[in-house]
């Protein structure tokens, strides 16, 4: 749906065209429940709360209302070269029995999070792939999104800034005749359990299958993309427990070290995968020592004490050269009782659609 905010002259300053899916974890008398629902087609802009920003004082905001008192707000900010959705907030009313059947509380909840939605000034933000924003007990996924703020006239700009997920990874060049052909696509990796314990007991439980999606330049100057499975039978796990950081270190086949770092948002009591580091050897690579890391991730999120679970394959974008494919994942960090997974928070893809 298209949403628009206009200034006093009738000129649009924000335009947004997207569909949105919400995944909300809430409590019922019989335990935690996850509901997944879409932004309905009759969702509307709340004109008296949306704004183009007042001179010198505030930034533009888009407030969208739907159902029985639910609102999704996008707050924009800018600098000299870029603008962004600095904050996304979602207010939902648990007394709406249509969306939240059997909710044990009838209160109005507010959750918010910073986002990765950003674009060059005078260009539209475009993201065909899903853009996920994780908040406390809520995940909002925007699909096929075109968003622009700080507009000059009531139309999207010609230029666009594409989201990271939409950008093509380097194309796989066909190998030169004398070179060995790329390895065949491996079957799904085996799922294994990993745990990390410290002085206060277990701080990480994980069950997952891991596959590395590597893109690199070979010695013959061709670019190749390879899928490598982490073989649990040839992998040893270690790690550390900290108040703010939990690490899982996997040593595989003597040549690969895969490090996971889980962080915690103290204010929302949620854990999330914040960092991945890979060190491996690729004998046919132009630079055989392959080292990649990203410490600003926000994946595999759940409330501390609960576990994150996703049956469908998840792709975690680490860099243009590395994506991690995670199969049948269930993970719980920081607080693990009795060495067992807690209540499940399912990923959006697994949620029961209404």
């Amino acid at each position: 749906a298209m949403f628009m905010v206009k200034n006093g002259n009738g000129t649009a300053c924000i335009m947004a065209n997207f569909s949105a899916a919400f995944s909300v974890n809430y409590d019922t008398k019989s335990g935690p429940k996850n509901m997944t629902f879409d932004l309905p087609s009759d969702a509307t802009v709340v004109l008296n709360r949306s704004s183009c920003g007042k001179e010198n004082t505030s930034d533009p905001s888009l407030v969208i209302a739907f159902g029985r008192g639910h609102t999704l707000t996008l707050n924009f900010t800018r600098n000299a070269t870029r603008y962004s959705v600095q904050l996304m907030s979602f207010v939902y009313n648990l007394s709406d029995t249509h969306l939240f059947p059997n909710a044990s509380s009838k209160e109005i909840k507010t959750v918010e999070s910073i986002t990765d939605i950003r674009a060059d000034i005078d260009k539209k933000y475009r993201c065909v792939s899903g853009t996920q924003v994780h908040m406390n007990n809520v995940t909002v996924t925007l699909h096929d999104a075109t968003i622009q703020a700080y507009l000059s006239n009531s139309s999207f700009s010609r230029g666009e800034t594409r989201c990271e997920q939409d950008r093509p990874s380097p194309t796989t060049a066909p190998p030169a005749p004398p070179s060995p052909s790329p390895s065949p696509v491996p079957k799904s990796p085996s799922v294994d359990k990993y745990n990390v314990s410290g002085t206060n007991g277990t701080c990480l439980l994980a069950s997952m299958g891991l596959q590395l999606n590597l893109t690199y330049e070979r010695k013959d100057n061709t670019t190749v993309t390879r899928l490598l499975n982490i073989n649990p039978n040839k992998t040893s796990a270690s790690g550390s427990c900290g108040a703010h950081l939990v690490t899982l270190e996997l040593h595989s086949e003597g040549t690969t070290v895969l490090l996971f770092q889980f962080g915690m948002n103290a204010s929302s009591s949620r854990f999330f995968l914040q960092g991945i580091q890979l060190n491996t050897i690729l004998p046919d690579a132009l630079v055989p020592t392959f080292s990649i890391s990203n410490h600003s991730l926000k994946a595999l999120q759940a409330t501390v004490g609960n576990s994150y679970k996703c049956n469908t394959e998840e792709h975690i974008f680490v860099s243009k050269m590395l994506s991690l494919n995670v199969f049948s994942v269930q993970v719980q960090a920081f607080k693990v009782d009795s060495d067992r997974f807690g209540s499940v928070e399912e990923c959006v893809q697994d949620g029961n659609s209404m």
């Epitope: 001179e55 800018r78 000299a80 260009k123 000059s152 700009s157 230029g159």
Partner: antibody
Framework: QVQLQQSGAELVKPGASVKMSCKAS????????IHWVKKSPGQGLEWIGA????????PYSQKFKDKATLTADKSSSTTYMQLSRLTSEDSAVYYC???????????WGQGTLVSVSA | DIQMTQSPPSLSASLGGKVTITCKAS??????MAWYQDKPGKGPRLLIH???TLQPGIPSRFSGSGSGRDYSFSISNLEPEDIATYYC????????FGGGTKLEIK
Amino acid sequence: QVQLQQSGAELVKPGASVKMSCKASGYIFTNYNIHWVKKSPGQGLEWIGAIYPGNGDAPYSQKFKDKATLTADKSSSTTYMQLSRLTSEDSAVYYCVRANWDVAFAYWGQGTLVSVSA
Amino acid sequence: DIQMTQSPPSLSASLGGKVTITCKASQDIDRYMAWYQDKPGKGPRLLIHDTSTLQPGIPSRFSGSGSGRDYSFSISNLEPEDIATYYCLQYDNLWTFGGGTKLEIK
């Protein structure tokens, strides 16, 4: 209508600093970047940097990042550029410029002539 | 910073004739290209933006084209008041001017 009024010509000694101003009118000052452009006989037009008056964010050209400092005063709708450690190479006309959204540099001040001489 | 290579640095042409100036960017600038006319004692004047869109009041003798990294600017039916220095400007990623082309009439 949009107007950019620049301060007068400056004659300065080598090694000194100079600070020039650009007062904007006819539009909401915090809605647009103000750019600074150098015009010299030897080098032609060169983009120095820009400032977004809303929060003072200022990207610079690599060449000028140690030479120029851009600031903005929202209360007076005025942007300033200070040039430091002046040499004869800095003798030029300096323009403040405003873009018209995605229509590049549409509005130009009248220019400030800086002459560096012992 | 994106580099802009403008050529030729100077050119001479006859009244009524046509001239073409080119600019090459160090990377794709997605048609975010403008052209300026600069006369001594005056501020630069925007002629074309978005590669080929003429500013209001600019005669249709001026034109621009290009895509990717390569752009060109032409003046046909040259008139005496066209004597000036012309600059390209990319504004896709920060802002960079070309080195300028000084136009003289034979």
